[in-house]
């Protein structure tokens, strides 16, 4: 297992599969997307990333989904952070939450290979998909709930789809939403979000 020394006092050492889903729409400017990436990397610095502890995936979504890091990628935490920092700014007209939740359900969590770990999708959303794309939204959220995947929506800015955020929250008590007025609030909320995710994950059982 490839490990590196902790970079911060708070360091989440739990059994967790965490997926970062980044809104690639033009509702975020290129500069705002830079702040979003910095937030993801800052969060990753506070996780004990390894195949044994916290596994991470990073996906940018627009009308489709682009995975930059997969849960099973065996790389040093610093290398994974470097890859996350290089996520491309798509600036597309549409970012489909339905499509990315479908991708999370059928691609990322198609097989549950770590039943002992918590599964969380951190949905960073700043836009609203067209109604025609959201027909199966609830179905995908329910599918994720069946697979015990907690969905944590982080609404960013005035165009985040509050209706979808509320629908996600209704599906499970753990699906706590964070609604921010802009990317400038991400840094302020970071520690609270990391703590919340970490508290949802089990500690490793003591060695027998």
């Amino acid at each position: 297992d490839i490990s590196e020394p902790p970079l911060h006092d708070f360091y989440c050492s739990r059994l967790l599969d965490l997926v970062f889903l980044l809104d690639g729409s033009s509702r975020l400017s290129e500069a705002e997307f830079e702040v979003l990436k910095a937030f993801v990397v800052d969060m990753m610095e506070r996780l004990r990333i390894s195949q044994k502890w916290v596994r991470v995936a990073v996906v940018e979504y627009h009308d489709g989904s682009h995975a930059y890091i997969g849960l099973k990628d065996r790389k040093r935490p610093s290398e994974l952070r470097r890859i996350a920092s290089q996520v491309k700014y798509a600036g597309s007209q549409v970012a489909s939450t339905s499509e990315v939740l479908k991708y999370t359900l059928f691609q990322i969590f198609s097989k549950i290979d770590r039943p002992e770990a918590s599964r969380i999708a951190l949905l960073l959303m700043a836009s609203q998909e067209p109604q025609r794309m959201s027909r199966n939204f609830v179905r995908y959220v329910q599918g994720l709930k069946k697979k015990k995947v907690i969905v944590i929506p982080v609404g960013i800015g005035p165009h985040a789809n509050l209706k979808q955020i509320r629908l996600i929250e209704k599906q499970a008590p753990e699906n706590k939403a964070f609604v921010l007025s802009s990317v400038d609030e991400l840094e302020q909320q970071r520690d609270e979000i990391v703590s919340y995710l970490c508290d949802l994950a089990p500690e490793a059982p003591p060695p027998t």
């Epitope: 290129e30 705002e32 830079e34 910095a38 990397v41 920092s85 996520v87 600036g91």
Partner: nanobody, 126 residues
């Protein structure tokens, strides 16, 4: 290859304004995110401001509201308008460019920028 040349730095009094320019040559300028960094004597180089290919901007907290980064794609130039200058703004100011809009990194880290100018000295006296 991108070449960057800064200009506009000089000695000014506290409270004055100054505009730095960074002229770029060598490739498609309009698609490149750019930034200004600065290095004060005896200190490490630090991030000042960022401008995306869409002209969206970011600033370090100490200059927000006083400095403005802008770009003129027709002239292949990025500017840093500095107002209400303070003695603590004294530094060599460097212009930096990404290698492309799509190979990036964290905006406030030096390693995210492939191309650098030689720097221009700004001195603010009290």
């Amino acid at each position: 290859e991108v070449q960057l040349v800064e200009s506009g730095g000089r000695l000014v009094k506290a409270g004055a304004s100054l505009r730095l320019s960074c002229a770029a040559s060598g490739r498609t300028f309009s698609s490149l995110p750019m930034a200004w960094f600065r290095q004060a004597p005896g200190k490490e180089r630090e991030f000042v401001a960022f401008i995306g290919s869409d002209s969206s901007t970011l600033y370090t907290s100490s200059v927000r509201g006083r400095f403005t980064i802008s770009r003129d794609n027709g002239k292949n130039t990025v500017y840093l308008q500095m107002m209400n200058l303070k003695p603590e703004d004294t530094a060599v100011y460097y212009c930096a460019a990404r290698s492309s809009a799509f190979s990036s990194g964290i905006y406030y880290r030096e390693g995210s920028y492939a191309y650098w100018g030689q720097g221009t000295q700004v001195t603010v006296s009290s």
